[in-house]
């Protein structure tokens, strides 16, 4: 089953995704595609890289987190009701059939009337069962899926948005990543 | 194939505003960032900032907040740059370079031709 | 902001010759450091990114090498075009520093 993210219509959706490269900048192509992964590549391609650098990518797709470190994670631009659905995170890890393939959910709500939380950056040892975090750019709100049911085949934690928190050094080490070489 | 043209080079007083353009060809516009790079005579390269071309909004280097904007013109594939209250020390040849959106994609790959842009009284 | 200083300022060769320019990052950037040309009266053309990854359309002669704060940007067998000025660029950090640039000259 599919991981569940969350965002309101106009904010920015961050749909994460990890491996850890075997050496930096010794990267393994990735592609993200609309719907669940196929038996093969992607459908519906809106984001690939290569083992160089990010290669094909189309309007509101993006990366915001270090590719080159394994940090794949999928930021989509000022999303509408129509970007709801399953996205595939596909890691091509050469050989027969050793793929990394992950489904993730992507939930769009209505946007709120009323005005967003600000920016949250105190965490307490126990973590929220939902938490909003703000990035880099505009309208960057985010809310994130369950945390508590992070596992090793979600390849799912916050370093992107949460780069300058600990709790991103602490999500990560947890194990939570796909680890190649 | 890829081309960013520039607008022309312009004289201005001290305390005018001017506005230079970029106009993108053979690729998507939106799909790119535009960054704007200032080179003053003689002198080496300083990022600006840039424009996240599909959402319209501006990161600007610290010292180009202010008196300085980025803006688009998603229609005609052209983003601008416009310098208000011009000070002398705006002197010089201010390129447009196409930039990826991603975080920590950041080479320039393809440059305007620069547009010079003298300040004096 | 990270500071990135070049070395020589100017460098004197002759055709042929294989030169090195350097570049240093006041703090590590891992490899995300871009190599520029930049001739006279002309734009900055990118010549190698990610510290050693070449570009379509730029001679085999350029070669980049180095990771975290030392880079080193190498032009196998000079040539009379290749007089200009070279700029590294930190990719990692905003406002993505230049370096002061490196003038090739021809003797």
């Known amino acids: 089953s599919e991981v569940e993210y969350r965002a309101e219509v106009g904010q920015n959706a961050y749909l994460p995704c990890f491996y850890t490269p075997a050496a930096p900048g010794n990267l393994v192509p990735v592609c993200w595609g609309k719907g669940a992964c196929p038996v093969f590549e992607c459908g519906n391609v809106v984001l690939r890289t290569d083992e160089r650098d990010v290669n094909y990518w189309t309007s509101r797709y993006w990366l915001n987190g270090d590719f080159r470190k394994g940090d794949v994670s999928l930021t989509i631009e000022n999303v509408t009701l129509a970007d709801s659905g399953i996205y595939c995170c596909r890691i091509q890890i050469p050989g027969i059939m050793n793929d990394e393939k992950f489904n993730l959910k992507l939930v769009i709500k209505p946007a709120k009337v009323t005005p967003a939380p600000t920016r949250q950056r105190d965490f307490t040892a126990a973590f929220p069962r939902m938490l909003t975090t703000r990035g880099h750019g505009p309208a960057e709100t985010q809310t994130l899926g369950s945390l508590p049911d992070i596992n090793l085949t979600q390849i799912s934690t916050l370093a992107n948005e949460l780069r300058d928190s600990r709790l991103a050094n602490d999500l990560r080490d947890s194990g939570a990543t796909i680890r190649i070489g | 194939q890829i081309q960013l043209v520039q607008s022309g080079p312009e004289l201005k007083k001290p305390g005018e505003t001017v506005k230079i353009s970029c106009k993108a060809s053979?690729?998507?516009?939106?799909?790119?960032?535009m960054s704007w790079v200032k080179q003053a005579p003689g002198k080496g390269l300083k990022l600006m900032g840039w424009?996240?071309?599909?959402?319209?909004?501006?990161t600007y280097a610290d010292d180009f907040k202010g008196r300085f904007a980025f803006s688009l013109e998603t229609s005609a594939s052209a983003a601008y740059l416009q310098i208000n209250n011009l000070k002398n020390e705006d002197t010089a040849t201010y390129f447009c370079?196409?930039?990826?959106?991603?975080?920590?994609?950041?080479?320039?790959?393809?440059w305007g031709q620069g547009t010079t842009l003298t300040v004096s009284s | 902001d990270i500071v990135m200083t070049q070395s020589p300022a100017t460098l004197s060769v002759t055709p042929g010759d294989r030169v090195s320019l350097s570049c240093r990052a006041s703090?590590?950037?891992?490899?995300?450091l871009h190599w520029y040309q930049q001739k006279s009266h002309e734009s900055p053309r990118l010549l190698i990114k990610y510290a050693s990854q070449s570009i379509s359309g730029i001679p085999s002669r350029f070669s980049g090498s180095g990771s975290g704060s030392d880079f080193t940007l190498s032009i196998n067998s000079v040539e009379p075009e290749d007089v200009g000025v070279y700029y590294c660029?930190?990719?990692?950090?905003?406002?993505?520093?230049f370096g002061g640039g490196t003038k090739l000259e021809i003797k």
């Open positions: 703090q590590s950037i891992s490899d995300y």
């Open positions: 660029q930190n990719g990692h950090s905003f406002p993505y520093t």
């Open positions: 053979g690729y998507t516009f939106t799909t790119y960032g």
């Open positions: 424009i996240n071309t599909y959402s319209g909004a501006p």
């Open positions: 370079a196409r930039k990826p959106p991603h975080y920590y994609v950041n080479s320039f790959d393809y």
